[in-house]
């Protein structure tokens, strides 16, 4: 009897180990979204970037949803959010309308239940991109740890979107779940 | 009999708890590598930085390997990768060959099976470091969430390596595993 | 008898699952602290920032302590630490004492047992904020993975604190535990 129980226990514990491993390590939501430059707005004002890749190159998503330019949370939890935004200008692109630029990123959270948008993180710099240099470049990185509820949406706003670097290694944002909410 | 089973179960569950805790929390790979400035290349072009500390000061590594200037993945998984690169110049170091600088970092992944190198993340800025100021400084930070396979290698490329700040709190890169691959 | 044992086992395993989930996913320490701008030091020198929110807006803390301007570690482990610091100046604030600025952040660790302070991460830039532009902005982001022991304290030092952006999305720092120490 005791032997039978041990064997049964080993079997159940084995499946429990699999279950625990799967539930803990594999079900954790994440996303890494890279810029889709085929549809970048013009203008120098602050705009929401709605075109992102989620399934090509470095871009990937799991247990989160990408819809209408927003990253949607499917699972309550504490997440680490990050964004890397690169701006660049080459003289061959033409003359800048102004050499004094505000190059900014805003990572925002929208709650559908209470239709409101709040900025979680911002970063950037004012730059003087003079005509003396043929090429200009600048990158922003922001990151932080936030409580997100199912249904909340993360989006990215930038100034001067026409200066965005369209490479997947340059302009991206993402999130990964770190822990549950108590 | 029932009491004996309960006691045995508690004992087995106890060891299971230890095992689960150990396997989950302690076996997760990570690395934090700090610049070894004794062997920095001299040019201003983009170069791969091959000298990093892995076992002194803040530098550490576990369940990953550092070899030939590359951080080698030993365990499949999704990892958060990051890099912080600081550049600095003091007039006592001499006159800059040009005051217009591209200060850049590229975090690259190399697959040995398919010998190819791809940039995962890039960041930086063009800077005008004029002789009017005796000291100049600039830092770049990049970070992102990537799927890495065992045997893949992470390396760091920078422009103007002779301008790197050699402090361990200034120029470093790292990775930590967040979750398994489904 | 065997049926009773199975039922008991399921019940115990169920509670074990709850316990494991709670201990693993919920007890992990974290903090996200946002600047409290009511008490920012003046001057352009390097100062320690002691006023942070821990319980309003995006600010939160769990299984860590905030005291005397320092984030105190309560649980040994490997943590990801990060900081985002924004500086800004508008001409309506008055003329800058100097147009050549060092805008810097230092993330430091203090051990009470051995009263010593060490910089874990630094970042920033020298900037020329000329009077030709009415508004200037610059953000710094740093992040890294560090071994922290119970009782150790994390604090933030910046230069030019009077230029700090007081928004909660602009100037903040934080930490979250990733794994235990072996």
């Amino acid at each position: 009897g005791s032997q039978h129980i041990r064997a049964e226990k080993a079997m159940v514990d084995g499946s429990w180990l699999d279950l625990a491993k799967r539930s803990k390590l594999e079900a954790q939501p994440f996303a890494h979204l890279t810029i889709n430059a085929t549809d970048i707005p013009s203008g120098s004002h602050k705009v929401s970037l709605s075109s992102w890749y989620h399934d090509r190159g470095w871009a990937k998503i799991s247990n989160m949803t990408f819809s209408n330019g927003k990253l949607i949370v499917n699972q309550d939890g504490f997440y680490y959010l990050y964004a890397n935004i690169c701006f660049r200008h080459h003289e061959t692109s033409g003359d800048l309308a102004t050499e004094y630029l505000q190059l900014m990123v805003y990572v925002t959270k929208t709650s559908i239940k209470i239709p409101s948008s709040h900025t979680l993180m911002k970063g950037g710099s004012t730059k003087y991109w003079s005509g003396n240099s043929e090429f200009h470049f600048y990158s922003i990185n922001v990151g932080g740890f936030f409580k997100l509820r199912s249904g909340e949406e993360i989006s990215i706003e930038v100034s001067n979107p026409s200066l965005l670097d369209p490479d997947q290694d340059a302009t991206y944002f993402g999130a990964f779940k770190v822990r549950d909410i108590d | 009999g029932s009491q004996h089973i309960r006691a045995e179960k508690a004992m087995v569950d106890g060891s299971w708890l230890d095992l689960a805790k150990r396997s989950k929390l302690e076996a997760q790979p990570f690395a934090h590598l700090t610049i070894n400035a004794t062997d920095i290349p001299s040019g201003s072009h983009k170069v791969s930085l091959s000298s990093w500390y892995h076992d002194r000061g803040w530098a550490k590594i576990s369940n990953m390997t550092f070899s030939n200037g590359k951080l080698i993945v030993n365990q499949d998984g999704f990892y958060y990768l990051y890099a912080n690169i600081c550049f600095r110049h003091h007039e006592t170091s001499g006159d800059l060959a040009t005051e217009y600088l591209q200060l850049m970092v590229y975090v690259t992944k190399t697959s040995i099976k398919i010998p190819s190198s791809h940039t995962l993340m890039k960041g930086g800025s063009t800077k005008y470091w004029s002789g009017n100021s005796e000291f100049h400084f600039y830092s770049i930070n990049v970070g992102g969430f990537f799927k890495l396979r065992s045997g893949e290698e992470i390396s760091i490329e920078v422009s103007n390596p002779s301008l790197l700040d050699p402090d361990q709190d200034a120029t470093y890169f790292g990775a930590f595993k967040v979750r398994d691959i489904d | 008898g065997s049926q009773h044992i199975r039922a008991e086992k399921a019940m115990v395993d169920g509670s074990w699952l709850d316990l494991a989930k709670r201990s693993k996913l919920e007890a992990q320490p974290f903090a996200h602290l946002t600047i409290n701008a009511t008490d920012i030091p003046s001057g352009s020198h390097k100062v320690s920032l002691s006023s942070w929110y821990h319980d309003r807006g995006w600010a939160k803390i769990s299984n860590m302590t905030f005291s005397n301007g320092k984030l105190i570690v309560n649980q040994d482990g490997f943590y990801y630490l990060y900081a985002n610091i924004c500086f800004r100046h508008h001409e309506t604030s008055g003329d800058l004492a100097t147009e050549y600025l060092q805008l810097m952040v230092y993330v430091t660790k203090t051990s009470i047992k051995i009263p010593s302070s060490h910089t874990l991460m630094k970042g920033g830039s020298t900037k020329y904020w000329s009077g030709n532009s009415e508004f200037h902005f610059y953000s710094i982001n740093v992040g890294g993975f560090f071994k922290l022991r119970s009782g150790e304290e994390i604090s933030i030092e910046v230069s030019n604190p009077s230029l700090l952006d007081p928004d909660q999305d602009a100037t903040y720092f934080g930490a979250f535990k990733v794994r235990d120490i072996d």
């Epitope: - | 001299s42 040019g43 201003s44 072009h45 170069v47 006159d95 800059l96 060959a97 040009t98 | -």
Partner: antibody, heavy 121, light 107 residues
């Protein structure tokens, strides 16, 4: 291996022009400043001109200012010296040389070509 | 422009001798001084940069010292391959100048 090969020297009459070339190989040409240095027969070395790695900065010895122009084509890994209004005192072996540091001036010249002879008579 | 004065112009020595060559700048150049060796019909070869740093691959018997206006090149034990001409070269404020050279010949 790291190599610099000069060409374009020859005999030329005073007042005429000549263009020297220096082909670089074995190192990342785009990462380093480049010099021209000359040596008159049985004389010492004289620095002539330098160009930064990106071509934005150029400096000359006073005696050639306004007559000589240093340039580079980073896509072709080639350095040039355009010499106009040549004089008898420009007669020398002309060497191209690589800057030891790409970022800073002042660290010396660590790689030299074999030289090309220019005779003005 | 800064003038560089090398001394002596010619130096006669034997194998195994310790040899010192001096270079003086007309005003301070901090440590921005290099030393070169040149053999007849050949291009110069960098020995020392930034006054005292030994170029990679150069024998350790060569050493440099000095800062400001006075600099020295020392060959601790002269070898047969060391008989050649030696030049100092300064850098200051976007200008480069060489000394007139020192010829080391066999005594």
């Amino acid at each position: 291996q790291v190599q610099l090969v000069e060409s374009g020297g020859g005999v030329v009459q005073p007042g005429r022009s000549l263009r020297l070339s220096c082909a670089a190989s074995g190192f990342t040409f785009t990462g380093y400043g480049m010099h021209w240095v000359r040596q008159a027969p049985d004389k010492g070395l004289e620095w002539v001109a330098v160009i930064s790695y990106d071509g934005t900065n150029k400096y000359y010895v006073d005696s050639v200012k306004g007559r000589f122009t240093i340039s580079r084509d980073n896509s072709q890994n080639t350095l040039y010296l355009q010499m106009n209004s040549l004089r008898a005192e420009d007669t020398a072996v002309y060497y191209c040389a690589k800057c030891l540091s790409g970022t800073y001036w002042g660290y010396g010249m660590d790689v030299w070509g074999q030289g090309t002879t220019v005779t003005v008579s | 422009d800064i003038q560089m004065t090398q001394s002596p112009s010619t130096l006669s020595a034997s194998v195994g001798d310790r040899v010192t060559i001096t270079c003086r700048a007309s005003r301070s150049i901090n440590s921005w001084l290099a030393w070169y060796q040149q053999k007849p019909g050949k291009a110069p070869k960098l020995l020392i940069y930034k006054a005292s740093s030994l170029e990679s691959g150069v024998p350790s018997r060569f050493s440099g010292s000095g800062s400001g206006t006075e600099f020295t090149l020392t060959i601790s034990s002269l070898q047969p391959d060391d008989f050649a001409s030696y030049y100092c070269q300064q850098y200051n404020n976007y200008s480069w100048t060489f000394g007139q050279g020192t010829k080391v010949e066999i005594k």
